[in-house]
């Protein structure tokens, strides 16, 4: 299984994130038997916090730091299991991991986004 | 891999000042904003400053007009200023670059009243 992120995806403050996580499969989506994972770290060598889970429905964990923010915006059977974060803060930045099983399927897909949360640089001053 | 290392924390009485060092093992001018969290017990970490490669600052609210992010680029150093110290902003210090693949253990901030 081959999963397809951008390595970083740079959204400015205050603002909506797409976080793009697509898959390719040599078999259909069951979604029976197919499994998503979303996790969130704040650093490297963080632990991961879960807070998406797919298990024949979407499961939202709602984790404390999300808040209400996070909404699946993927589509399985179209091998798309993206996600929305709304209202992007300086604390969302970090590393989100997307893992994915899709029986018969032995291999975990993986794929690990960089989110950098960009600050609005102050307008520059008129020297005149 | 960079190694973040911050120093500069300790107890300090409300109304004081610390000056808190991050300094990081390779340069720094790759990295477009270095950024400093707080994290006190039992609550998620808040975001504190930031700077940008090109000196840009930002700031969350409650620390606007007390602290002051700078970076030293010649040192690989990012400082964080704070005056005006009140008990609320106790908790442990940390920096972070970029995009939260690196970060440091931290050093602890006190603000007795």
């Known amino acids: 299984m081959e999963v397809t992120v951008p390595a970083t995806l740079n959204v400015l403050n205050g603002s909506d994130a797409r976080l793009p996580c697509t898959f390719n499969s040599c078999y259909t989506v069951n979604h029976k038997q197919f499994s998503l994972n979303w996790t969130y770290q704040e650093c490297n060598n963080c632990s991961e916090e879960m807070f998406l889970q797919f298990r024949m429905k979407i499961i939202n964990l709602k984790l404390e730091r999300f808040q209400d923010r996070v909404e699946f915006s993927g589509n399985p059977s179209k091998y798309d299991v993206s996600v929305m974060l709304r209202n992007v803060q300086p604390e969302d930045e970090g590393i989100y991991n997307c893992y994915i099983m899709n029986p018969p399927d032995r291999h975990r897909g993986h794929g690990k986004i960089h989110l950098q949360v960009l600050m609005e640089e102050p307008p520059e001053r008129d020297s005149t | 891999e960079v190694q973040l290392v911050e120093s500069g924390g300790g107890l300090v009485q409300a109304g004081g000042s610390l000056r808190l060092s991050c300094a990081a093992s390779k340069s720094i001018l790759s990295f477009a904003y270095m950024r400093w969290y707080r994290q006190a017990p039992g609550k998620q970490r808040e975001f504190v400053a930031s700077?940008?490669?090109?000196?840009?600052?930002s700031y969350t609210d409650s620390v606007k007009g007390r602290f002051t992010i700078s970076r030293d680029n010649a040192k690989n150093t990012v400082y964080l200023q704070m005056n005006s110290l009140k008990p609320e902003d106790t908790a442990v210090y940390y920096c972070?670059?970029?995009?939260?693949?690196?970060r440091g253990q931290g050093t602890l901030v006190t603000v007795s009243s």
């Open positions: 972070s670059a970029p995009a939260g693949q690196y």
């Open positions: 700077i940008a490669i090109g000196g840009a600052t």
